[in-house]
């Protein structure tokens, strides 16, 4: 486990929290419960208590937001960054923010509460089996009244438990019609409507009349949202699946992966895909608000990221139904607050105590790792020290691995990547790195484990660079990039998210090119890259030898050091200096002997 510099923590044990707003992905009661359960994980192992309050004077303010949401750490749209939290302290410190561009669930698909039926309002279970077929969304199959329904267990055929899904044919919300269902068709401005509409509104809300004639009666309600069948992406984002729909002449009553090679479920948003070509992706499993909140609240209580992959505080999201807290999480939080006091002895009760589950994290399926949040952005020293910004060095005590001859940087033939970070040169090779500061008689320090400092990264890196203004570190490996701000990571993201085409197999280096701009290299090509927008300008593509004549065309790494550009091929580098807009090779040398000052023995 790791804590923030100075062991930032709350100095009282009765912590308060305020849920400032909500996501529309989940019923409010489910969100309230997810947060309460997430806090309960931490109170179970410490003397802390958590009380919900209804004002911004709370210690921990919980907010859903998108993009730039008022704290200087913008979210990034769907996936990538899921949430972030600030270490304990006044004001924004201690607050936890969740990216509302994610699909929030309990980790197993959209949560759709039911009404009526025989399941007492239980949520739908997706997928469910009905008459031998699998359904991943509510359906009207088996009914003649057009009311969508779902099974609340995995198999309706065996369990017979069901409820009705939110539907305008069942009820409407707000408006002025006391929740009455829509009346189809209805007349609005002389036109007939047989479905909910956004006509007449500028805010995109779907509404309907609850009598046959809105023009006459002026009675209306808003149509309930259908999270299970609201599509993402495609060419109809935000619209609803229409079931059944026709695709290649065949009828589909549920989302399908037919016609796709990647297995992703999709649906048409009109009744006939063949003629209308309107479609979108069906909701995925979503991220467990409970698990992500538990992780973020760990930060809000003073825990930084753990390097133990099974720990809740590890910086990667992984869905599990086992107990989320790992021994490492417990040790960390107890380091800050101590253990939970033993309860007062009580007279024996007659109920048999239930066995507790073993304290191990048991993933219930292949542990597919998703990109995590960028959490804990903020000062790593006590608040009185002023904002030191995101920690640029990560944990200050990087683990040094036992030294063997191959672990001496001077014995490394070819480094995977080299980068100037701060005012030191970092050299990466096969899961390890060295640090080098120029000076008489200085030797590279290390090796250190990449996983200790940047736990999300793979062992093999193609290139690394630091953007000086934001102190962001970009790590490239294959078709992926990770962006670290201090100890917080965004990624992995695919290179195409940066605007690099599928033909770019890797990024082999980067050079600064003006304020907030970089040049990215891949083989013989280069592009101008805007660090803030995190996009390349596709029109800026150029050939390396046009801009840097005299360097080899098959360089495996390009980096900047002491304001000069280095192009590496094999064990050698070509150094380029820029004078009056001319790039000229002014030195060729060995990385080890000439840069690292290794002895030539």
């Amino acid at each position: 486990f790791q804590t923030f510099e100075g062991d930032l923590k709350w100095h009282h044990h009765n912590i308060t929290y305020w849920i400032q707003n909500y996501s529309e992905d989940l019923p409010r009661a489910v969100i309230d419960d997810a947060f309460a359960r997430a806090f309960a994980l931490w109170s179970a192992v410490t003397p802390l208590t958590f009380t919900r309050v209804y004002s911004r004077d709370a210690d921990i303010v919980i907010q859903f937001g998108v993009a730039e949401h008022g704290d200087g750490y913008p979210f990034d749209g769907k996936d990538g960054l899921l949430a972030h939290a600030f270490p304990p302290g006044p004001g924004i410190q201690g607050d936890a923010h969740f990216d509302d561009d994610e699909l929030w669930s309990l980790g197993k698909g959209v949560v759709v509460p039911t009404r009526f039926g025989n399941a007492d309002g239980a949520a739908c279970h997706f997928p469910f089996i009905f008459e031998g077929r699998s359904y991943s969304a509510c359906t009207t199959d088996g009914r003649s009244d057009g009311l969508p329904w779902c099974s609340t267990t995995a198999n309706y055929d065996t369990d017979d438990r069901f409820g009705f899904c939110p539907s305008e044919r069942l009820y409407t919300q707000d408006g002025n019609a006391d929740g009455k269902p829509c009346q189809f068709p209805f007349i609005f401005q002389g036109q007939s409507y047989s479905a909910c509409t956004t006509d007449g509104r500028s805010d995109g809300y779907r509404w309907c009349a609850t009598t046959a004639n809105y023009d006459r009666d002026k009675l209306f309600g808003f149509c309930p949202t259908r999270a299970d069948s609201t599509v993402m992406g495609g060419n109809s984002a935000g619209e609803l699946c229409v079931f059944p729909f026709t695709f290649l002449g065949k009828e589909y009553s549920t989302c399908t992966s037919e016609g796709r090679g990647d297995g992703r479920l999709w649906c048409a948003t009109t009744s006939n895909f063949d003629s209308d070509k309107k479609w979108g992706f069906c909701p995925d499993q979503g991220y467990s608000l409970f698990l992500v909140a538990a992780h973020e609240f760990g930060h809000a209580l003073g825990l930084d990221h753990s390097s133990v992959p099974e720990a809740l505080m590890y910086p990667m999201y992984r869905f599990t139904e086992g107990p989320p807290l790992h021994k490492d999480d417990v040790n960390g939080i107890r380091h800050l607050y101590g253990p939970r006091p033993e309860p007062e002895p009580r007279p024996p009760t007659t109920t048999t105590p239930q066995p507790t589950a073993p304290p191990t994290v048991c993933p219930t399926g292949p542990p597919t790792v998703h990109p995590s949040e960028r959490p804990t952005a903020g000062p790593t020293g006590p608040p009185s020290a002023g904002p030191t910004g995101p920690p640029t060095a990560g944990p200050s005590t990087a683990t040094t691995v036992p030294l063997s001859p191959v672990d001496d940087a001077c014995n490394v033939n070819i480094f995977d990547a080299i980068a100037e970070i701060g005012n030191q040169l970092y050299l990466f090779k096969d899961g390890k790195y060295w640090r080098f500061s120029e000076g008489r008689g200085s030797r590279p320090q290390g090796p250190f484990l990449i996983a200790d400092k940047w736990p999300a990264l793979p062992r093999k890196l193609d290139s690394v660079f630091e953007e000086r203004l934001s102190k962001k570190l970009f790590f490239f490996s294959g078709r992926q990039v990770w962006v670290y701000t201090g100890a917080s990571v965004l990624g992995p993201r695919r290179l195409d998210k940066l605007g690099l085409g599928a033909d770019v197999a890797q990024v082999t280096g980067a050079l600064r090119s003006g304020r907030g701009k970089m040049l990215l290299f891949s083989g013989r090509r280069l592009w101008r890259f805007d660090v803030k927008a995190q996009m390349v300008d596709p029109r800026s593509a150029s050939e390396v030898d046009r801009m840097f004549p005299g360097v080899p065309l098959d360089t495996h790494d390009v980096f900047q050091y002491r304001e000069k550009a280095y192009f590496c091929q094999d064990r050698f580098y070509w150094r380029v200096s820029s004078r009056s807009e001319l790039n000229q090779v002014d030195q060729v040398g060995y990385v080890t002997y000439d840069i690292l000052q290794c002895p030539e023995d």
């Epitope: 805010d203 995109g204 000062p379 608040p383």
Partner: antibody, heavy 116, light 108 residues
Framework: EVQLVQSGAEVKKPGASVKVSCKAS????????ISWVRQAPGQGLEWMGW????????NYAQKLQGRVTMTTDTSTSTAYMELRSLRSDDTAVYYC?????????WGQGTTVTVSS | QAVLTQPPSASGTPGQRVTISCSGS????????VNWYQQLPGTAPKLLIY???HRPSGVPDRFSGSNSWNTASLAISGLQSEDEADYYC?????????FGGGTKVTVL
Amino acid sequence: EVQLVQSGAEVKKPGASVKVSCKASGYTFTSYGISWVRQAPGQGLEWMGWISAYNGNTNYAQKLQGRVTMTTDTSTSTAYMELRSLRSDDTAVYYCARDYYGMDVWGQGTTVTVSS
Amino acid sequence: QAVLTQPPSASGTPGQRVTISCSGSTFNIGSNTVNWYQQLPGTAPKLLIYSDSHRPSGVPDRFSGSNSWNTASLAISGLQSEDEADYYCQAWDSSAVVFGGGTKVTVL
């Protein structure tokens, strides 16, 4: 007592720059954001931008992008707003406000007059 | 950029209830949280309601806020002469803060 105290009134010529200061006291300066809002004579409130005293990140109104710079000095708990290339329609009262789920503490305002 | 629309003026006699609306033109105010400010003549604005309906300490409970679908509202019940002021709604929209045009409340 939590308060924000702003620098005094300024009279500037078109094309000049102005830098308004806003000194915070009574709270942990680095744990909150500072928004800058201006109000032209007889007009409503116009948001100019925001700076995090926590990390120095800024977010400027599109309309003022390129002309405005917001900074903080954490050692003196002071926020600054500089507006360049002043025009007559920049004549306004400029307010700083502590921003945390609402602008809950406001400075007294600084009158900036742009006139040739 | 989005615009928040408020009625330019509202009035009432002492003791009456006055409601001011605030609606979004190009974005959905209902899925944002709205703050309300009171600006007495010649003074800096003051936070009156935050996050749709919460009153900071010191704000009388005759002020209340709500926000549903695409309209946020500020209600002043039991209007008093010292409530004569300009009232502004404010929300976040895609990375920017937006103020309404303001409503001048007159106590008749």
